[in-house]
């Protein structure tokens, strides 16, 4: 059977003794991944000492000594009685110290200490030349294991291939003896046959203490890189991920022990243990209940998985994603945490493992270790959060995250209000319950203090900004959210944010999150007052010169900057200015800025969405006369006629509220004429609705909350911010939907249809509209 | 040096017992497994039957119920009781010694022939 001795070798191994497992796993000799050791976290100590700042000396201690020690009195006599012991045994001391072999036994010499704890002087002069006896000693005995190993190897090779099972099980005790003295050691790991014999005798025996002492010696061997190449030449891989399906503890043990080593520092083992099956054995260990086995097995799937997506389906047509994820719920233990969330974070950037890992439950079970001290755990808890949570946004429970989630955002670690933000972002898209949850635990004054601490770090503002842009939209607490913003004094820093350094996909967000702040009549006059107005037709102008120069030089293709199309940037500012429009005083700035002649222009856009906010803005524009007379003689009624036959409700509606807005100082029998011509193109499946308006009595005025229609299938930009210690270049999926109808079948909300006063039955007899007419502002996008 | 001296063996009936002795010799170290193996004209050596210092008994799955491997520690001897023997366990019956010492050391006896056959 297994000593207590043996089975010590193992950290793992279920012993008491924990100052011997550490002593184990700090060998210097042993190269681990430093899981368990930490041995590569601080320079080796030269002095021996564990630490070279520490002194030796506990000075309070010496004091009190110092003190209590000379408390009692001597007498003359007593006194150089005492000092001719020291002089008649000085000799003998010198020798106790440096040679304490040649003293005689039970012979006593007066120690010159009171405190036996403490070395004598005479003792700490000794010291260098014990040392260097020592070292002596140990190179004879060094010598005489590599000869005694050198000559015994051959026979214990013919021994572990002898046909007597008893024989070989010997033999293999002795090597696995062999094998833990650093010398023969070597000795066997430089004889091919002697590894190969060890390899074959583990995966062909049928005795439990020739397979631990067998898979024991590998694990020794596996301590340096020449016992690793022995390992790998001799087809030790296979074998090892034969003994994966040991039912004997220890030798499971050895074998991920051993295979982690050969992992981390053997080329072409990562390739080998993929074909020998070693992934589905893997997965197999992950219902074991040893925190320190299973932290070595799921480092050994990361190193499988990261950068190797094959391996990554393989972990999930095991069933690992849920293996895993019950870790996370399951443990305390630290570095299980750690490597198992490294794995999850490997799996989070692969697409079949997403929603596996989301399925299983895994953005609650990482969410409960954002708390944790560790802070190695916490990042990659939040960096796979963060790579999931795009594929999350139809998941329940998420209440405990969110609010984790935005207490992080007043984290000092910049990574961590990164990632807080990014998964914030993406889990408020489309799910109305998880935009009340953030607007009831804080989120708008945490978010809006994120965005004002953040500066011009992007890849702070834009996430926080879109997680504001999902909270102030579509759903029962978005009015609240539209006046905390302003109260939590967002509104400068949200403005600001239009104008340099922003980017392009920030300043993006941020005109989608004034649109929905425009939403609240009270943000009207602030953001007026902050310079938004101006800024935005300073955009929209900058953007439509951009898309107008590319179609002159016959470019049909829409084209990115910065990874945004100017399209989107047209339509979000027309968007933005249109909801602002509603106010009276903003009205008048818009008109002033001379933008009439843009908007009838952007009427001829071959872009459905651009065609809706530019007949919007006019709509609202044209409710004063001197701007619907500016708008008749910028030859809007040719373009506007043109788009009552849009087979886009959306642009056919405002349309028409522009044109018979326009019609307001206009004979009876031009209104007339307009009434038949609206009748028939707007309402062309239910004439009935028309005529239930009675004379077309169109009270155009104050704008409610537009009408929206809703789909159900989101599809998310997931966008890169490099060096997020994922796999390879993952995509971080950060944003939600891109702007725009180009994506079809996305939860595009509408941006509105006029709110048509009494005629409001009008509008209840519009069919529903298709996608192209959704636009991105509100973007849940 | 490690001497073994073998003794038995001889022809039997098919159905029959013999027993084969093997007395040790010399420098004998406690760490050991005593055995005996066969080998035929033309045949490779086959393992029969061990038992270790500690009286663990392996056999080889042809004899395993028929023959018994005993051992008397303090005489340093080993004896392999053969019952229902059959014609095919005709063969050179060797005594082996293997010793776990550093380096491990492999004796055998000199060979009794037994023979099965009506």
């Known amino acids: 059977m297994a000593t207590q001795a043996d089975l010590m070798e193992l950290d793992m191994a279920m012993e008491p003794d924990r100052k011997a497992a550490v002593s184990h796993w700090q060998q210097q000799s042993y190269l681990d991944s430093g899981i368990h050791s930490g041995a590569t976290t601080t320079a080796p100590s030269l002095s021996g000492k564990g630490n070279p700042e520490e002194e030796d000396v506990d000075t309070s201690q010496v004091l009190y000594e110092w003190e209590q020690g000379f408390s009692q009195s001597f007498t003359q006599e007593q006194v150089a009685d005492i000092d001719g012991q020291y002089a008649m045994t000085r000799a003998q001391r010198v020798r106790a110290a440096m040679f304490p072999e040649t003293l005689d036994e039970g012979m006593q010499i007066p120690s010159t200490q009171f405190d036996a704890a403490h070395p004598t002087n005479v003792q700490r002069l000794a010291e260098p030349s014990q040392m260097l006896k020592h070292a002596v000693v140990n190179l004879i005995n060094y010598q005489d294991d590599a000869e005694l190993a050198t000559r015994a190897i051959p026979e214990l090779t013919k021994l572990l291939n002898d046909e007597d099972q008893v024989v070989v099980n010997k033999a293999a005790v002795m090597v696995h003896q062999l094998s833990k003295k650093e010398a023969s050691r070597h000795a066997i790991m430089r004889s091919p046959q002697m590894v190969s014999a060890i390899v074959r005798t583990m995966q062909n025996t049928n005795d439990v203490e020739t397979a631990r002492c067998t898979a024991g010696t590998l694990h020794n061997l596996s301590h340096h890189r020449e016992g690793l190449l022995a390992i790998f030449k001799s087809g030790g891989i296979p074998a090892l991920v034969k003994m994966l399906g040991s039912p004997v503890d220890s030798v499971l043990f050895y074998a991920i022990t051993t295979l982690h080593n050969l992992l981390l520092h053997q080329e072409g083992a990562k390739m080998a243990v993929r074909l020998a099956g070693g992934l589905q054995k893997m997965v197999a260990l992950l219902n074991k209940t040893n925190v320190k086995f299973l932290a070595i097995t799921t480092d050994c799937l990361q190193i499988l998985a990261y950068g190797n997506q094959e391996s990554k389906l393989i972990i999930l047509a095991s069933g690992g994603p849920q293996a895993l994820v019950n870790i996370m719920r399951t443990y305390t233990y630290e570095k299980l945490l750690w490597t198992t969330s490294r794995v999850l974070k490997v799996l989070s950037v692969c697409s079949s493992n997403k929603p596996a890992i989301v399925e299983a439950g895994g953005m609650q079970a990482l969410g409960l270790h954002l708390t944790d001290p560790s802070q190695r755990l916490v990042q990659n808890c939040l960096w796979t959060l963060r790579n999931l949570s795009d594929a999350a946004t139809k998941q329940e429970g998420m209440e405990g995250l969110l609010g984790t989630l935005v207490q992080l955002l007043g984290s000092d670690d910049i990574n961590v209000v990164t990632c807080a933000a990014g998964i914030l972002s993406n889990l408020t898209c489309n799910n109305y319950k998880n935009k009340m949850m953030v607007c009831q635990v804080g989120g708008i004054e945490a978010l809006v203090r994120t965005v004002l601490r953040a500066g011009d770090r992007e890849d702070i503002t834009e996430p926080a900004i879109c997680a504001l842009r999902h909270l102030t939209s579509r759903h029962q607490e978005a009015e609240m959210a539209q006046n905390a913003v302003r109260l939590h004094y967002g509104l400068p820093v949200v403005v600001k944010l239009l104008h340099p350094p922003s980017h392009w996909p920030l300043i993006k967000a941020t005109v989608g999150l004034i649109r929905n702040l425009a939403l609240c009549p009270a943000n009207h006059a602030p953001l007026r007052e902050q310079g938004a107005i101006p800024r935005l037709v300073q955009l929209l102008v900058r953007a439509h010169q951009d898309t107008q120069r590319r179609t002159s030089m016959g470019g049909t293709q829409q084209q990115f900057v910065e990874g945004v199309r100017m399209e989107e940037i047209v339509e979000g500012c027309t968007g933005a200015l249109h909801i602002l429009a509603r106010d009276v005083h903003n009205r008048i700035v818009i008109r002033g800025l001379n933008t009439i002649p843009l908007f009838v222009q952007l009427l001829y856009s071959p872009i459905e969405n651009i065609q809706r906010v530019a007949a919007g803005v006019l709509c609202e524009l044209a409710q004063d006369k001197e701007a619907a007379e500016a708008i008749e003689a910028e030859g809007a009624t040719a373009p506007l006629t043109e788009l009552l036959h849009s087979r886009n409700e959306g642009v056919a509606t405002y349309a028409a509220a522009v044109l018979f807005r326009m019609s307001e100082d206009k004979p009876q029998d031009y209104k007339k004429r307009l009434s038949v011509e609206l009748t028939s193109s707007l309402f062309r499946t239910e004439p009935m609705a028309w005529n239930e308006t009675a004379d077309l009595g169109l009270d155009i005025g104050a704008q409610g909350e537009p009408l929206g229609y809703r789909q159900d299938d989101p599809s998310y930009r997931s966008f890169h911010s490099g060096g997020y210690g994922q796999d390879a270049l993952g995509m971080d999926p950060m944003m939600e939907h891109e702007m725009g109808g180009h994506h079809p079948g996305a939860d595009y909300p509408v941006d509105g249809l006029p709110d048509l006063g009494h005629a409001q039955d009008l509008m209840d007899g519009l069919p529903p509209g298709d996608s192209n007419q959704l636009a991105w502002f509100d973007t849940d996008l | 040096q490690v001497q073994l001296v073998q003794s038995g063996g001889g022809l039997v009936q098919p159905g029959g017992s013999l027993r084969l002795s093997c007395a040790a010799s010399?420098?004998?170290?406690?760490?050991?497994?005593m055995g005996w193996y066969r080998q035929g004209p033309g045949k490779q050596r086959e393992f029969v039957a061990s038992?270790?210092?500690?009286?663990?008994?392996n056999y080889a799955a042809s004899v395993k119920g028929r023959f018994t491997i005993s051992r008397d520690n303090a005489k340093n001897t080993v004896n392999l009781q053969m019952n229902s023997l059959r014609p095919e366990d005709t063969d050179v019956y060797y005594c082996?010694?293997?010793?776990?010492?550093?380096?491990?050391?492999?004796?055998w006896g000199q060979g009794t022939q037994v023979t099965v056959s009506s």
């Open positions: 010399g420098s004998i170290s406690s760490n050991n497994v």
């Open positions: 038992i270790t210092d500690s009286d663990l008994a």
């Open positions: 082996r010694l293997t010793m776990m010492t550093a380096p491990p050391t492999i004796s």
